[in-house]
């Protein structure tokens, strides 16, 4: 016959935290390392599983199809209960009865999920919601891939996602000095760069690249490049295209300039010649299927031209340049230099030799163009 279990036989209650969908092992150890009778029950005293002879038997609980035990460890006095595919409602106090002792284990199951799709456009907000058992008071701390820390209770909000928020977020849920860690993969849909500037001499070929900061197996969308030339009063659509997986197909392209677009990712455009009339800035937008909003990348084109006309040597730049950029004309191997924080510099009656036109930013040369000035002989005076 079974002995009554006294209060002193009741071991201190352990707290175990579990993750929704995961597997948890609740341990229960007998003092003697041998196979003996044991039972696991829930707080309502409903039997979940136990031993009968040498066989595992299961009771009428809701856990019967998800609960198991490691039979191989029974003869070592270990009578753990394994619960698979954890649910929030599995949170309960579980009692292990062995050797006339009761071991209580409180299981608290938590779930952490993103409220929306985990593929979000740059600038959109991310909300993480914690599912927790009634009566619990957990705290949550999340760390972004970039090292940003955010704390909260049942919900955590990131108002404006940035490129560097892409990757695995690690969230720690704490309750009763115990912790459980969640990992959530967030993909921020954006271009690698928000803005880029291409510096070219007049006549050179121009390449614009728009690499994405993410990779997706299936990628469908459409895009357009609008261009605002410095010399033009209004912007113009240069190209429209479709995207399917890695395949890019041009829908419509302007006749001037004669742009060419690569037929596969990363998005890439080629302008046959850099000309002053093309200098300016563009905005490439990409709308992805099933996503609200668009991805944007700004691109700037700065064009340089060096010319000699009669006694005047001129260097000019067109396009978006910052006021701190310096434009200078200097004679190779000579000290002669003219510098200005302007978009044009010139030298009257330049000395013969190879002149360099330089566009620089704090000493760093962004663009240079060479022009040879030939000596001009004075015309002989007619007698």
């Amino acid at each position: 016959e079974q002995k009554l279990i006294s209060e002193e036989d009741l071991a201190a209650k352990k707290v175990v935290l579990g993750k929704k969908g995961d597997t948890v092992e609740l341990t229960c150890n007998a003092s003697q390392k041998k196979n003996t009778q044991f039972h696991w029950k829930n707080s309502n005293q409903i039997k979940i599983l136990g031993i009968q002879g040498l066989f595992l038997t299961k009771g009428p609980s809701k856990l019967s199809d998800r609960a198991d035990s490691r039979k191989s460890l029974w003869d070592q006095g270990c009578f753990s209960m394994i619960i698979k595919n954890l649910k929030i409602e599995d949170s309960d106090t579980y009692i292990c009865e062995v050797e006339n002792k009761k071991e209580e284990v409180e299981l608290l199951v938590f779930g952490l999920t993103a409220n929306s799709d985990t593929h979000l456009l740059e600038g959109q907000s991310l909300t993480l919601t914690l599912e927790s058992p009634p009566g619990s008071s957990p705290s949550v701390k999340c760390r972004s891939p970039g090292g940003k820390n955010i704390q909260g209770g049942r919900t955590i909000s990131v108002p404006q996602l940035e490129r560097q928020d892409s990757g695995t977020w690690t969230c720690t849920v704490s309750q009763d000095q115990k912790t459980v860690e969640f990992k959530i993969d967030i993909v921020v849909l954006a271009f690698q760069k928000a803005s880029s500037t291409v510096y070219k001499k007049e006549g050179e070929q121009v390449e614009f690249s728009f690499p994405l900061a993410f990779t997706l197996e299936k990628l469908t969308g459409s895009g357009e490049l609008w261009w605002q030339a410095e010399r033009a009063s209004s912007s113009k659509s240069w190209i429209t295209f479709d995207l399917k997986n890695k395949e890019v197909s041009v829908k419509r392209v302007t006749q001037d300039p004669k742009l060419q677009m690569g037929k596969k990712l990363p998005l890439h455009l080629t302008l046959p010649q850099a000309l002053p009339q093309y200098a300016g800035s563009g905005n490439l937008t990409l709308a992805l299927e099933a996503k609200t909003g668009k991805l944007h990348q700004e691109v700037n084109l700065v064009v340089m031209r060096a010319t000699q006309f009669q006694e005047n040597l001129t260097c000019e730049v067109w396009g978006p340049t910052s006021p701190k950029l310096t434009l200078s004309l200097k004679l190779e191997n000579k000290g002669a230099t003219v510098s200005k924080q302007a978009k044009a510099v010139w030298v009257l009656n330049p000395e013969a030799g190879m002149w360099q036109c330089l566009l620089s930013d704090s000493g760093q040369v962004l663009l240079e163009s060479n022009i040879k000035v030939v000596p001009t002989w004075p015309t002989p005076v007619q007698p």
Epitope: E207, S249, M261, G262, K264, H268
Partner: antibody, heavy 118, light 107 residues
């Protein structure tokens, strides 16, 4: 094993028409870009036409635009090239080719010969 | 259309020689370039994609390099089975264009 088998070549008079077929096996036909490339006797390779499996978009070389039409029947795993207003210079071995995931022509058929002559 | 200029159009070499074939694009094509080998009466064989990526089963004596407009195919030590015609293909945009070919003959 990926296999491509062209058929439909033959002798045709200038101004005539011909339809080439390419039967594909060993891969998910509808997922890939398919192309036709030709080679005139003793000459180099000359891209003729491509068709996307994902979008159905078609692309043709300027030399055949308005005369040749590429099409596909994904249910039959077959690629076609409808050729009309044929000229002497269209005489060539016509190869069917499959693009890989990176959009390069990686697998080619053995070719079918088209001769345009009066 | 983008023009592809291949050089030389033919070359004579001996087994064990190092052979270099160049291909120049009329405009920048990133690294969207493939190399093909063709033997008489046979279909072309795909050797290299993305200018330098060797296809599986292609011997390591073949290598490719280049970006933008200038590309190179190198055979480090020519073997008897390498005597063939080699073509470059720009795969940057449609229309796709091949180089005119380089015939590698036995000296």
């Amino acid at each position: 094993e990926v296999q491509l088998l062209e058929s439909g070549g033959g002798l045709v008079q200038p101004g005539g028409s011909l339809r080439l077929s390419c039967s594909a096996s060993g891969f998910t036909f509808s997922d890939y870009v398919m192309s036709w490339v030709r080679q005139a006797p003793g000459k180099g390779l000359d891209w003729v036409s491509s068709i996307s499996g994902l979008t159905g978009n078609t692309y043709h070389a300027d030399s055949v635009k308005g005369r040749f039409t590429i099409s596909r029947d994904n249910s039959k795993n077959t690629l076609y090239l409808q050729m009309s207003s044929l000229r002497d210079e269209d005489t060539a071995v016509y190869y069917c080719a499959k693009d890989n995931e990176d959009y390069y022509m990686d697998v080619w058929g053995k070719g079918t010969t088209v001769t345009v002559s009066s | 259309a983008i023009q592809m200029t291949q050089s030389p159009s033919s070359l004579s070499a001996s087994v064990g020689d190092r052979v270099t074939i160049t291909c120049r694009a009329s405009q920048g094509i990133r690294n969207d370039l493939g190399w093909y080998q063709q033997k008489p009466g046979k279909a072309p064989k795909f050797l290299i994609s993305a200018a330098s990526s060797l296809q599986s089963g292609v011997p390591s004596r073949f290598s490719g390099s280049g970006y933008g407009t200038d590309f190179t195919l190198t055979i480090s030590s020519l073997q008897p089975e390498d005597f063939a015609t080699y073509y470059c293909l720009q795969d940057y945009t449609y229309p796709r264009t091949f180089g005119q070919g380089t015939k590698v003959e036995i000296k």
